[in-house]
């Protein structure tokens, strides 16, 4: 779509003659007829295929034609076309004399031809005018012409329509060839896609206007590259949305079960040793002189039975002293005035003389100890049972009675409550402090998923894309376990699609 523009500049007919050789009376009142058509090697009569136009009377005999932008006698003349400009044309310009109306001479009777010119050739679209002058025996015409594109049409042949716009269907201006030039911050074939904030994650972020970064469900952070962990996840992180991967020392569905109570809470006092024993479980092993669950109680100085050979212990404020039985002396009654002749060894112990009869030593039979084999052996004094196990003397040996959840000679092994698969109907087992907890699949509930239910949170099938639905820890809540490639609280969002991709 474009316009062929013809600028008439000067016409000379000094003798005031018509084409038939007769003079005009009183002078040649001149108007022009223009016919524009497709290129013809030999110009022929017929329709003006590219358009035609007539002028009012522009002057008498010889005259200069001024530019006029409005009203009658507009100059340059406009011949609009609504097709692709072919680059070639034929143009016929006829000068006529009219005896009648100045403004619409075309309709007057008695019009006579003064002269005509015909040009055929090629013409490229452009702003520059092509000037020409045609002379014949009687007349001379000076004119120029060009082809320009109509508003919003572009390209070599004015065939490319482009209208600049700045709305949600495009944000662009038009290049000289009609291609789109996106406004800053916009991209895409139609410049309708905003360029998001630099670094905004390609899949997890999006924007509605330039330099924005809005996060898709399951993602957060200024660049939408941080996943949102499962709601209620206490001491855990995620690599994909709604995950809850526990930090070291934490366990359970929401990473709220403390597996390292010793480090996190330091419950054992007075230099005692702390041993973890399952979620929130621990045991304190006290140093000599302390007792209590947390070794917080100080024992009496005599509690460690420091007096030997039957000596009796007396507590003082910061110390103790031993009252020795006859035949013994020393701070702890450790020295004896007896010899083997005095039969000092009890419970079948055998006596050995030492230091030329000055002293003796008793060799005790099994299960007895002490200077004189006077004490029964307590094999539990070293606290050999871990994880709060109870030590029992059993004749020549001792055994550990373990707390629930532990086994082994010294109760050192943790039994998984889940090892015996207590969850029915495909429930997922979690070891917690108070025993196993089952996360039930859709349609089941109860401590062991043993109860079949018809109306639970999963019954409506809230999970998409083949995800497995779990009712969590109560039937009214559900958790969707997404298959690979999907995220979201209901697994409704595919990961890694191109921008056309919803979410």
């Amino acid at each position: 779509s474009g316009i062929f523009q013809l600028r008439l500049q000067e016409f000379a007919n000094e003798r005031g003659m018509l084409a038939n050789g007769r003079p005009c009376e009183p002078g040649c009142r001149t108007f022009f007829r223009i016919c524009l058509k497709h290129y013809q090697a030999t110009f022929s009569e017929g329709p003006c295929t590219f358009g035609n136009v007539s002028t009012p009377v522009l002057g008498t005999n010889s005259f200069v034609i001024r530019d006029k932008n409005s009203g009658s006698g507009r100059n340059p003349l406009q011949l609009p076309f609504n097709f692709t400009w072919p680059g070639t044309f034929s143009l016929n310009i006829q000068a006529w004399h009219t005896p009648g109306d100045d403004l619409r001479p075309e309709t007057s009777p008695g019009n006579s031809l003064i002269s005509q010119i015909i040009i055929q050739g090629s013409l490229a679209v452009g702003k520059n005018w092509k000037s020409d002058e045609q002379n014949n025996t009687l007349t001379r015409l000076r004119y120029s012409y060009r082809v320009v594109c109509s508003d919003n049409y572009y390209g070599d042949s004015c065939s490319r329509l482009c209208k600049k716009r700045d709305d949600h269907f495009g944000h662009y201006e038009c290049q000289p060839d009609g291609s789109l030039s996106c406004l800053p911050g916009w991209t895409g074939k139609y410049c309708d896609q905003p360029i998001c904030l630099s670094g905004c994650h390609e899949q997890n972020g999006y924007c509605s206007k330039p330099d924005e970064c809005n996060c898709r469900p399951g993602w957060q952070g200024p660049l939408c590259n941080e996943c949102i962990p499962h709601n209620g996840c206490r001491h855990g992180t995620c690599t994909i949305p709604w995950q809850c991967a526990c930090d070291e020392g934490w366990g359970g569905l929401f990473c709220d079960q403390d597996l390292n109570y010793c480090t996190h809470h330091s419950p054992c006092k007075n230099g005692s040793t702390c041993s973890n024993s399952g979620p929130r479980g621990y045991t304190c092993t006290c140093l000599p002189g302390y007792t209590g669950e947390h070794c917080e109680l100080e024992l009496s100085k005599c509690a460690s039975n420091p007096c030997r050979n039957g000596g009796s212990c007396k507590d003082h404020e910061n110390s103790y002293h031993c009252l020795c039985p006859p035949g013994y002396y020393g701070q702890h009654c450790e020295h004896s005035t007896l010899t083997c002749a005095d039969s000092p060894c009890f419970n079948g112990g055998s006596c050995r003389e030492r230091n030329q009869g000055a002293s003796y030593a008793c060799e005790c039979p099994p299960n007895f100890t002490g200077s004189n084999c006077e004490k029964k052996v307590d094999r539990c004094t070293s606290n050999p049972c871990a994880n709060g196990g109870q030590c029992l003397n059993r004749g020549p040996s001792r055994t550990c009675r373990c707390r629930p959840g532990f086994t082994g000679t010294h109760c050192e092994l943790h039994i998984s409550d889940c090892a015996r698969s207590p969850c029915a109907h495909g429930g997922t087992c979690h070891d917690l402090e108070n025993g196993p907890v089952c996360t039930c699949p859709a349609g089941f509930s109860g401590r062991r998923c043993e109860v079949r239910i018809t109306n639970d949170a999963c019954a409506s099938g809230p999970c998409f894309n083949g995800a497995t639905c779990y009712t969590g820890l109560s039937p009214n809540n559900f958790v969707c376990n997404c298959p690979y490639g999907f995220v979201g609280s209901r697994c409704e969002f595919p990961v890694g699609l191109p921008p056309s991709f919803p979410w």
């Epitope: 508003d151 209208k163 509605s208």
Partner: antibody
Framework: EVQLQESGPGLVKPSETLSLTCTVS??????????WGWIRQPPGKGLEWIGD???????YYNPSLKSRVTISVDTSKNQFSLKLSSVTAADTAVYYC?????????????WGQGTLVTVSS | SYELTQPPSVSVSPGQTASITCSGQ??????ASWYQQKPGQSPVLVIY???KRPSGIPERFSGSNSGDTATLTISGTQPMDEADYYC?????????FGYGTRVTVL
């Protein structure tokens, strides 16, 4: 072939909120080439554009209705919805949902069959 | 607000040409679309981007747009073309419809 289907109550009381849903089938509402619009036509009158929405949630509203209109999208259900609050008898119309194509420079090539909503007590 | 003005009605004899105009300020600088709506039916897009026809729309429908006026032309009008016709354009981010023209085939 893409199809759009409006649904919602045919009768709403004055001062209440009109709620309609458009379900798209045969194509994804999440394509980057389309906006999804609502247009209404009072009985015996012409078409009036209400507003439109992109799959990301960006919305554009007719300034004359903006204070009362909310359009939302649910990509997981391939649906978009219209809420028009504080309705009066002047809001009685056939409500159409339509697809506006970026490639067609905003022309609407697919329309729902329309649903008549009457505002009356 | 931006307005598009259409004549309320246009009458045409079968086989003749019907021209429907749509006027708006500098409408030629916007893309115009045209919709046909028959009684009891949804509108149908017949022209987009001033002069382009969607697939399935007969060649007798054509469009132009320049200055302040867009025109829908139906050449060789048929009785089945009797309908209401609406022009539409976008003013920034707002869709604007013309008031509609009833085309009657005599």
């Amino acid at each position: 072939e893409v199809q759009l289907q409006e649904s919602g109550p045919g009768l709403v009381k004055p001062s209440e909120t009109l709620s309609l849903t458009c379900t798209v089938s045969g194509g994804s509402i999440s394509s980057s080439s389309y906006y999804w619009g609502w247009i209404r036509q009072p009985p015996g009158k012409g078409l009036e554009w209400i507003g439109d929405i992109y799959y990301t949630g960006s919305t554009y509203y007719n300034p004359s209705l903006k204070s009362r209109v909310t359009i939302s999208v649910d990509t997981s259900k391939n649906q978009f919805s219209l809420k028009l609050s504080s309705v009066t008898a002047a809001d009685t119309a056939v409500y159409y949902c339509a697809r506006e194509d970026v490639i067609l420079r905003g022309g609407s090539d697919y329309w729902g069959q329309g649903t008549l909503v009457t505002v009356s007590s | 607000s931006y307005e598009l003005t259409q004549p309320p009605s246009v009458s045409v004899s079968p086989g003749q040409t019907a021209s429907i105009t749509c006027s708006g300020q500098r409408l030629g600088d916007k893309y115009a679309s045209w919709y046909q709506q028959k009684p009891g039916q949804s509108p149908v897009l017949v022209i987009y981007e001033d002069s382009k026809r969607p697939s399935g729309i007969p060649e007798r429908f054509s469009g132009s747009n320049s200055g302040d006026t867009a025109t829908l032309t139906i050449s060789g009008t048929q009785p089945m073309d009797e309908a209401d016709y609406y022009c539409q354009a976008w003013d920034r981010d707002t869709g604007v419809f013309g008031y509609g023209t009833r085309v009657t085939v005599l």
